[in-house]
């Protein structure tokens, strides 16, 4: 819901968090044969001033952080998003019940940054 | 502050917002000669289920949206971030007061998406 992440407590800095996703939990077990799930991971955390080198910030994110600092009502902080993503290979049934092996791009978060 | 963007109301979908940034407002007028400012723009808005084609979502973002739906307390929604960025050329004084013309990458948001 839109009220998620509304804590007034300080969040940690933008970083990668580990997350294993089971295809059964997603309701995809009937068409995905293998794997049963995968380490998808996700990005979360604050992109607050000053952005340090670990945050892989773009030039735009650096500018946006300063603008947010002076105009927080109008411009949000940059957001914590994947900067490096990996593919995974998936064995699945297509619409005609053929077994297909396909490489799905941008499935695994390897690194996060402020964007 | 930590309570920024804590609204429980529905936000509009992830999109590009126009924003002109004046280098004087950033306090950079003493070292940047030209331009006086530029259209930086920024990304903001919700990345909610279902992610449509306009949202330029990665496969990981699609998975994360589903995981968030089922585990909103643990996994955030994907965030609205730049998908295309442009450079700008800046004329400035370096530390030795030499006038330098340099192209700064990733300064202007051209498009946004869910990441």
């Amino acid at each position: 819901s839109a009220s998620d992440y509304n804590s007034s407590e300080l969040k940690t800095a933008c970083r990668k968090h580990e997350l294993y996703v089971s295809f059964q939990d997603l309701g995809w077990q009937d068409w995905i044969i293998a794997p049963k799930g995968y380490a998808a991971n996700y990005c979360d955390g604050e992109c607050s001033f000053p952005l340090n080198a670990h945050m892989n910030a773009t030039n735009h994110a650096i500018v946006q952080t300063l603008v947010h600092l002076m105009n927080p009502e109008y411009v949000p902080k940059p957001c914590c998003a994947p900067t490096k993503l990996n593919a995974i290979s998936v064995l699945y049934f297509d619409d005609n019940s053929n077994v297909i092996l396909k490489k799905y791009r941008n499935m695994v978060v390897r690194a996060c940054g402020c964007h | 502050s930590a309570s920024d963007y804590n609204s429980s109301e529905l936000k509009t979908a992830c999109r590009k917002h126009e924003l002109y940034v004046s280098f004087q407002d950033l306090g950079w007028q003493d070292w940047i000669i030209a331009p006086k400012g530029y259209a930086a723009n920024y990304c903001d808005g919700e990345c909610s289920f279902p992610l449509n084609a306009h949202m330029n979502a990665t496969n990981h973002a699609i998975v994360q949206t589903l995981v968030h739906l089922m585990n909103p307390e643990y996994v955030p929604k994907p965030c609205c971030a730049p998908t295309k960025l442009n450079a700008i050329s800046v004329l400035y004084f370096d530390d030795n007061s030499n006038v330098i013309l340099k192209k700064y990458r990733n300064m202007v948001v051209r498009a946004c998406g869910c990441h």
């Epitope: 009502e73 109008y74 411009v75 | 804590n6 109301e9």
Partner: antibody, heavy 118, light 108 residues
Framework: QVQLVQSGAEVQKPGASVKVSCKAS????????LHWVRQAPGQRLEWLGW????????DYSWKFQGRVTLTRDTSANTVYMELNSLTSEDSAVYYC???????????WGQGTLVTVSS | EIVLTQSPGTLSLSPGERATLSCWAS???????LAWYRQKPGQAPRLLIS???SRATDIPDRISGSGSGTDFTLTINRLEPEDFAVYYC?????????FGQGTKVEIK
Amino acid sequence: QVQLVQSGAEVQKPGASVKVSCKASGYTFTSYALHWVRQAPGQRLEWLGWISAANGNTDYSWKFQGRVTLTRDTSANTVYMELNSLTSEDSAVYYCARRKLWSPFDIWGQGTLVTVSS
Amino acid sequence: EIVLTQSPGTLSLSPGERATLSCWASQSLTNSFLAWYRQKPGQAPRLLISGAFSRATDIPDRISGSGSGTDFTLTINRLEPEDFAVYYCQYYGTSPWTFGQGTKVEIK
């Protein structure tokens, strides 16, 4: 013309809550943020918090965090400031004020006197 | 948090005279995000100056702002009856938005 009109004076008992309204007119309500500032007798102006009329985002001064709540009603072009757990020190004139990007407070409401007394 | 200190607390002057009001910041305001407001009894503050020296709409040119860094000044030339009021400086660069304690300009 551009104006902010606030609700009338309030008298509340210690421990009670007060809710003050601020109705905007003469401009596009959702294009600006509205801030709340108070002034106790003989004291300097004190910032409480802001609300974005566009999306309802809020931020509050650390001093009032947990005690103040800002909300908005876009259909009525109105924002509300609710302050809980009132004490005599909250007796003040409360103002809403508009702020543009990169700007100070350019338009102010007329003020609402809140008196906390047993 | 930036603290603003105004001086003097009270300024006693006659109509037609010049008023010079000072505002000091606890740290340098690199962007000069300093505003000045006038407040008359029973009224809301009114914006006079933004960006340390830019006059707001309908503010006469006998009112001017100057300064940078930590020291800022509001000057009112040829004081008129409506100028006798309390004046506040404000930093609006970053949250929290802070105000000075005010300078009262009264009729001598």
